[in-house]
């Protein structure tokens, strides 16, 4: 009983429960393949508990192993469009600091208009995650079609 | 050592480890696009620890942020079938209470016969999740091809 | 404060935070559809904390409910290749002990060159997970395109 009370009194942050779910804000200007994200209760069902946004990119605040997940749906798309513009590719990676730059997760659309995946990966405080969408097709900004999130899993 | 013992004695429910994994029971009658789910050890590898089923739909028992995931495979399907019946779409949303009704996750099959995705979302006690499959194609009831689940992640 | 200190002193293993993320090592010889995995910090961003590898297959060390996830990308592939070689199918299952053999998750490539999915499933100490890729197409060994992992969720 005492333990349960103690647990409730501890701030969640000390338990390492960092988590974020973001919705698409906008795409980058020409020559910038990055997707720019936004999050917060005022925007709907997106949120940031621990991680932060830095110019639309997600910055990690706690070292650990994270589950990273993403879904991106193309807005003006059919299987014909997708194959004609193949390969439209989505890559999630650490883009800063430059010394830790690496691609973590990559998928092509081929003849589909949605990609969705997830993976476990170690991330460190200060890592900024970027999501690059190659090609010219526009992603949907519907919050149930395009989203990106991370969940702290363990140290 | 005392803490470890205390932790083991605490009921899991008090730690907020609500989790469910469901298998497809049946599709709805005409004009009802919902999929109806079932779960429990007698049925195989499906289970409900915390959430409950209400007429085949999943009802949440604990407030928090959840990881929601789903995979649906169409039973009599080829890439030709899928494109000819396009758009066959799967949407997961809160369907009751009506005041909280919202689509959480949506995917189209395009030229594929399986969709799979996951996302983080806040859910509240009493939220009922519905999974709507538009179109006339039949989903597979194989437990390794079609499943739906939630996992409590944090308050 | 005392609780927070006690928590930090507890080995993570006693909290049941078993987790693994693997990268593709090689495919099997003729008549062996299994993918063979490898993991460890020397190999990049893959790791095993709890589970172990047994001849390239993942063996579980702790009973519980796990989130299992996988992504496989085909290396020499286009939507035409994928459909011509259909059905190329990926199945994740318990392959040993034989008494517990079962398919947990199955997807076909249809006209795509990547599959990705995840599910919750109960696993027991000693369960070995195998990933079978039917057909003759070669999977990519790029670590951001093909990976397989598990995360302990609750007892």
């Amino acid at each position: 009983q005492r333990f349960a009370q103690a647990q409730q009194q501890l701030p969640l942050e000390s338990l390492g429960w960092d988590v974020a779910e973001l919705q698409l804000n906008h795409t980058g200007p020409q020559q910038d393949p990055r997707l720019y994200w936004q999050g917060g209760p005022a925007l709907g069902r997106s949120f940031l508990h621990g991680p932060e946004l830095d110019k639309g990119q997600l910055r990690i605040h706690r070292d650990g192993i994270y589950m990273v997940h993403i879904q991106v749906t193309l807005a003006i798309c059919s299987s014909t469009t997708a194959s004609r513009h193949h390969p439209t590719t989505l890559a999630v990676g650490i883009c800063s600091p430059a010394s830790r730059s690496i691609s973590l997760l990559r998928l092509s659309f081929h003849q589909g208009c949605t990609i969705a995946s997830q993976r476990l990966t170690p991330l460190a405080r200060g890592d900024t995650l970027c999501t690059n969408l190659t090609g010219t097709l526009l992603p949907s900004r519907n919050t149930d079609e395009t989203f990106f999130g991370v969940q702290w899993v363990r140290p | 050592q005392r803490f470890a013992q205390a932790q083991q004695q605490l009921p899991l429910e008090s730690l907020g480890w609500d989790v469910a994994e469901l298998q497809l029971n049946h599709t709805g009658p005409q004009q009802d696009p919902r999929l109806y789910w079932q779960g429990g050890p007698a049925l195989g590898r499906s289970f409900l620890h915390g959430p409950e089923l209400d007429k085949g739909q999943l009802r949440i028992h604990r407030d928090g942020i959840y990881m929601v995931h789903i995979q649906v495979t169409l039973a009599i399907c080829s890439s030709t079938t899928a494109s000819r019946h396009h758009p066959t779409t799967l949407a997961v949303g809160i369907c009751s209470p009506a005041s909280r009704s919202i689509s959480l996750l949506r995917l189209s099959f395009h030229q594929g016969c399986t969709i799979a995705s996951q996302r983080l979302t806040p859910l509240a006690r009493g939220d009922t999740l519905c999974t709507n499959l538009t179109g006339t194609l039949l989903p597979s009831r194989n437990t390794d091809e079609t499943f739906f689940g939630v996992q409590w992640v944090r308050p | 404060q005392r609780f927070a200190q006690a928590q930090q002193q507890l080995p993570l293993e006693s909290l049941g935070w078993d987790v693994a993320e693997l990268q593709l090592n090689h495919t099997g010889p003729q008549q062996d559809p299994r993918l063979y995995w490898q993991g460890g910090p020397a190999l990049g961003r893959s790791f095993l904390h709890g589970p172990e590898l047994d001849k390239g297959q993942l063996r579980i060390h702790r009973d519980g409910i796990y989130m299992v996830h996988i992504q496989v990308t085909l290396a020499i592939c286009s939507s035409t290749t994928a459909s011509r070689h259909h059905p190329t199918t990926l199945a994740v299952g318990i392959c040993s002990p034989a008494s517990r053999s079962i398919s947990l998750l199955r997807l076909s490539f249809h006209q795509g060159c990547t599959i990705a999915s995840q599910r919750l499933t109960p696993l027991a100490r000693g369960d070995t997970l195998c990933t079978n890729l039917t057909g003759t197409l070669l999977p990519s060994r790029n670590t951001d395109e093909t990976f397989f992992g598990v995360q302990w969720v609750r007892p």
């Epitope: - | - | 090689h26 495919t27 062996d32 290396a75 020499i76 592939c77 035409t80 070669l138």
Partner: antibody, heavy 120, light 107 residues
Framework: EVQLLESGGGLVQPGGSLRLSCAAS????????MSWVRQSPGKCLEWVSA????????QYAESVQGRFTVSRDNSKNTLYLQMNSLRAEDTAVYYC?????????????WGQGTLVTVSS | EIVLTQSPATLSVSPGERATLSCRAS??????LAWYQQKPGQAPRLLIY???SRATGIPDRFSGSGSGTDFTLTISRLEPEDFAVYYC?????????FGCGTKVEIK
Amino acid sequence: EVQLLESGGGLVQPGGSLRLSCAASGFTFSSYAMSWVRQSPGKCLEWVSAISGSGGRAQYAESVQGRFTVSRDNSKNTLYLQMNSLRAEDTAVYYCAKHDYSNYPYFDYWGQGTLVTVSS
Amino acid sequence: EIVLTQSPATLSVSPGERATLSCRASQSVSSNLAWYQQKPGQAPRLLIYGSSSRATGIPDRFSGSGSGTDFTLTISRLEPEDFAVYYCQQYGSSPPPFGCGTKVEIK
């Protein structure tokens, strides 16, 4: 030093068969996918076939599917290409090539090639 | 099926000069493009992969750029041993086609 040495080329009549070999050294042969690539006189390079490191998976260009079979013997560090029902358009220099670790078909090492001539 | 078109077919350059070779894909290949050098009677040699990454042992006068459909191989200062035929190859989809080459000859 990585070395790939092809052999088995020669003159064959249309409809005939030939078996090419490629002896590999200087790397862990069984760890890498391998391909055959051909170059017709005065023409472009053309990918023919690929095989996984273990030998359990193989892929072919449409132009040779059903006629050619790629195989390997990892105990002998040797790659093979069995060519049946040969046609005039199969005339080319055949190279064996080592894939990058990723299994993607770009080739960091090539053999010197062996000439196959299909003519009556 | 993706078609790669190389231009020019022949490029006449003096030693020490810069050479710029082009490869255009019929549809986007992302960055899945490699460049090879082939001298008469020899096998091709990998120069660049991933559009811009130099292969092991390749001098830094060779550089690759581009993504999507337009790619360039640049040789900053031509050495006598650089006169050869250069091929581009797409490897992101099946089949993995090659271009038909650009011959770099001494002016």
